[in-house]
């Protein structure tokens, strides 16, 4: 396979939805950003298609993203960070379809992370704690974090609570008890950089006490 | 202008250790940019072995990995290359250049030294 | 390892004439390529890179094409100090590796 678009493929390919939609990671990697890109339509043929991003780059006029089965990504040091990149995607020498986009407004943090649940017997509460590794960024520092919980058995039935900081207070006459809970959080930039949400941390599981009978309170496990 | 000059013994001894430093002006290895050492026999083609990235991580070619080690004193802005156990097939000029991994050329080369393997 | 075959090994030319050379991947590689000129005794230029972008201060009598597998460099007129060596390399996957290269003598 040459990777040349004969007349026919290009007048076919014209008929196709190019759609994609792009994320950015700053300093995802030390220093490095990221930049992931992907077609909308899971159906489409990529066989020839490749992703190109030129303008507000340091040092370079454009660059090539990477393919990795269905998705097109790019870790580099040389996003300017001020103003808007062409996104375009390609085939041979032909520019299909191109976004211009700001990559700062097109942010998805990491994931947070070492999220932990305590109880705490004299304060009939839990404490929430996670950790973020946007603490120690440079650029996306300031982040909205949603945690989410739910009675195990109650599937679909989320309560969420937003906060800026790393940790939660739970009251316990707000739980059920002697009950299995899951809790999870994800995050989104809040100040000046916009994007999307991270992907949710990985579950944390806890079990609210028991009531005591005798005071109406819960026991601790 | 980003400059880069190679430096080392022309001749090592088979067996012994093959060591190259890179001089880099006019750009800090600590920047940006992969830094890499590129080698030629006589009479052929161009092999790359290797590079150091700006964060100090390193990548080789698996037929040198064995053998190979490159490192950089960023006090010096330098880079260099440890071939070691050398053979006969190891006589090339040795080529420092930056560029690769998000850029697909190496745009700045050095001159070239060249290493001859004999007894 | 991704093989790059070059062809051909070697050409000889006239000045003014059109010169192309190929090089074809073992596999796909997007843009990830190359173009180099080498003369005896002297480190390689870049000419080429991402497959079709011409590198500064090249003369644009030289040009790039092709995506995935198949690449060709053209030089559109042959000039006395066009004839050297010239290499492709791709930067897709490790090792990064070269073509044989090309070798334009004067006819």
């Known amino acids: 396979e040459s990777g040349y678009a004969q007349n026919g493929d290009l007048e076919d390919a014209e008929l196709d939805d190019y759609s994609f939609s792009c994320y950015s990671q700053l300093e995802v990697n030390g220093s490095q950003h990221s930049l992931t890109c992907a077609f909308e339509d899971p159906d489409v043929n990529i066989t020839n298609l490749e992703f190109e991003i030129c303008g507000a780059l340091v040092e370079v006029k454009c660059l090539n993203f990477r393919k990795l089965q269905e998705i097109y990504f790019i870790e580099t040091k040389k996003f300017l960070l001020i103003g808007k990149s062409n996104i375009c995607v390609k085939v041979g020498e032909k520019s299909l379809t191109c976004k211009k986009i700001d990559l700062t407004t097109i942010v998805k943090p990491e994931a947070p992370f070492d999220l932990s649940v305590v109880y705490r017997e004299g304060a009939n509460d839990f404490v929430v704690t996670f950790n973020t590794s946007h603490l120690q960024k440079k650029y996306v520092k300031v982040l909205m974090h949603d945690v989410a919980y739910r009675q195990e058995k109650d599937e679909n039935k989320w309560t969420h609570v937003n906060l800026s900081s790393t940790k939660l207070t739970l009251l316990q006459r707000k739980l059920q008890p002697a009950a299995m809970y899951e809790i999870k959080v994800r995050s989104i930039p809040d100040h000046y950089f916009k994007g999307f949400w991270s992907e949710w941390s990985p579950s944390y599981y806890f079990r609210t006490p028991e009531i005591n009978n005798s005071s109406g309170e819960m026991d601790p496990i | 202008q980003v400059q880069l000059q190679e430096s080392g013994p022309g001749l090592v001894k088979p067996s012994e250790t093959l060591s190259l430093t890179c001089t880099v002006s006019?750009?800090?290895?600590?920047?940006?940019?992969?830094w890499n050492w590129i080698r030629q026999p006589p009479g052929k083609g161009l092999e790359w072995i290797g590079y150091?990235?700006?964060?100090?991580?390193?990548t080789y070619t698996p037929s040198l990995k064995s053998r190979v080690t490159i490192s950089r004193d960023t006090s010096k802005n330098q880079f260099s290359l440890k071939l070691s156990s050398v053979t006969a097939a190891d006589t090339a000029v040795y080529y420092c250049?930056?560029?690769?991994?998000?850029?697909?050329?190496?745009?700045?080369w050095g001159q070239g030294t060249t290493v001859t393997v004999s007894s | 390892d991704i093989q790059m075959l070059q062809s051909p090994s070697s050409l000889s030319a006239s000045v003014g004439d059109r010169v192309t050379i190929t090089c074809l991947a073992s596999?796909?590689?997007?843009?990830?390529l190359a173009w180099y000129q080498q003369k005896p005794g002297k480190a390689p230029k870049l000419l080429i890179y991402?497959?079709?972008r011409l590198a500064d201060g090249v003369p644009s009598r030289f040009s790039g094409s092709g995506s995935g597998t198949m690449f060709t460099l053209t030089i559109s007129s042959l000039q006395p100090e066009d004839f050297a060596t010239y290499y492709c390399?791709?930067?897709?996957?490790?090792?990064?590796?070269f073509g044989g290269g090309t070798k334009v003598e004067i006819k």
């Open positions: 250049a930056r560029g690769g991994y998000d850029v697909n050329y190496f745009d700045y």
């Open positions: 006019g750009y800090s290895v600590t920047t940006d940019y992969a």
């Open positions: 150091i990235f700006y964060s100090g991580s390193t």
């Open positions: 596999q796909t590689i997007g843009y990830w």
């Open positions: 991402a497959a079709t």
């Open positions: 390399q791709q930067f897709f996957s490790y090792p990064w590796t």
